[in-house]
Amino acid sequence: LQDPCSNCPAGTFCDNNRNQICSPCPPNSFSSAGGQRTCDICRQCKGVFRTRKECSSTSNAECDCTPGFHCLGAGCSMCEQDCKQGQELTKKGCKDCCFGTFNDQKRGICRPWTNCSLDGKSVLVNGTKERDVVCGPSPADLSPGASSVTPPAPAREPGHSPQ
């Protein structure tokens, strides 16, 4: 025998109190798959969170952070203050990157400039608080037809910076 609940579509639940009739999810709840015996409560986006996507009978709400903040954690479980490029967030707030480091994003930590000499290259464009150095040609690259500029190493994913 087929389970009668398997006929209940997303957005409904199989109501045991009503002879397993498919009942619509109550307000502020949802079921994203069929055959559910209960509907899940919708996530609420309040305070530092704002609603990115409203809850519907078939899908949960999604939150992001209010302007001036960015999400941390899967599903935006926490919000952290933005800083300007050339800064990082410390326990004392947003602070400029120290000399020799940069941050080209509004989040994350200041990272050391690329050391061009490790690759036998010279500095073509100096680094700033906001930008990495651009490494120029090594002597071997000066032969005709050689590319004169190598792009900076791709930025690694910034770690979680202090509050």
Partner: antibody, heavy 115, light 107 residues
């Protein structure tokens, strides 16, 4: 440095109103809201309510008839008022900054309700 | 409201051992669970947010896992300073709620 500090009378008589302030520094009251959370002696944590950066509030239904949370941006202070207190309201009261989880708390202040 | 139930109520272990603390939610709360450590006379301290993300400055012996209704805090190798009370809390739906706590004591 983000800091929150609760203050107020440590002793309140039954049926009176408990009034606490949370003085903050290191962040803007127009950017962050604050939650109030309490902890009766030897027990767990209980969320009372919150005031958001725009000034709107949310309260736990268990307190809604007797709680008011407000903000005074000129003094960098949030306040909690809880009316008609009983011995069951004896607790350490904390304020915590709203950042989606509670990363920054005050040190807490003990309020005893007794005649 | 969403009820969080922590177990065990008390856990007696020795330094160097592994601690496993459980938190069960009465409803699906996704991954919106945080873990806090509280020592006597102090405010709670955030350890884990979003079920599995270690907060800034928290040692990597602390880890969190789980989603939906079942969550776990693991301390891989207990240090003397880890003996305290641990609370889980949910930030999914209002009113925000906390578990009743697990006391981690020295055996």
């Amino acid at each position: 440095q983000v800091q929150l500090q609760e203050s107020g009378p440590g002793l309140v008589k039954p049926s009176q109103t408990l009034s606490l302030t949370c003085t903050v520094s290191g962040f803007s009251l127009t950017t962050y809201g604050v939650h109030w959370i309490r902890q009766p002696p030897g027990k767990g944590l209980e969320w009372i309510g919150a005031i958001w950066s725009g000034g709107s509030t949310d309260y736990n239904a268990a307190f809604i008839s007797r709680v008011t949370i407000s903000v005074d941006t000129s003094k960098n202070q949030f306040s909690l008022k809880l009316s008609s207190v009983t011995a069951a309201d004896t607790a350490v009261y904390y304020c915590a900054r709203d950042d989606g989880s509670f990363a920054n708390w005050g040190q807490g202040t003990l309020v005893t309700v007794s005649s | 409201e969403i009820v969080l139930t922590q177990s065990p109520g008390t856990l007696s272990l020795s330094p160097g051992e592994r601690a496993t603390l459980s938190c069960k939610a009465s409803e699906n709360v996704g991954t919106y669970v945080s873990w806090y450590q509280q020592k006597p006379g102090q405010a709670p301290r955030l350890l884990i947010y979003g079920a599995s993300n270690r907060y800034t400055g928290i040692p990597d012996r602390f880890s969190g896992s789980g989603s939906g209704t079942d969550f776990t805090l693991t301390i891989s190798r207990l240090e003397p300073e880890d003996f305290a009370v641990y609370y889980c809390g949910q930030t999914y739906s209002y009113p925000l709620t906390f578990g009743q706590g697990t006391r981690l004591e020295i055996k």
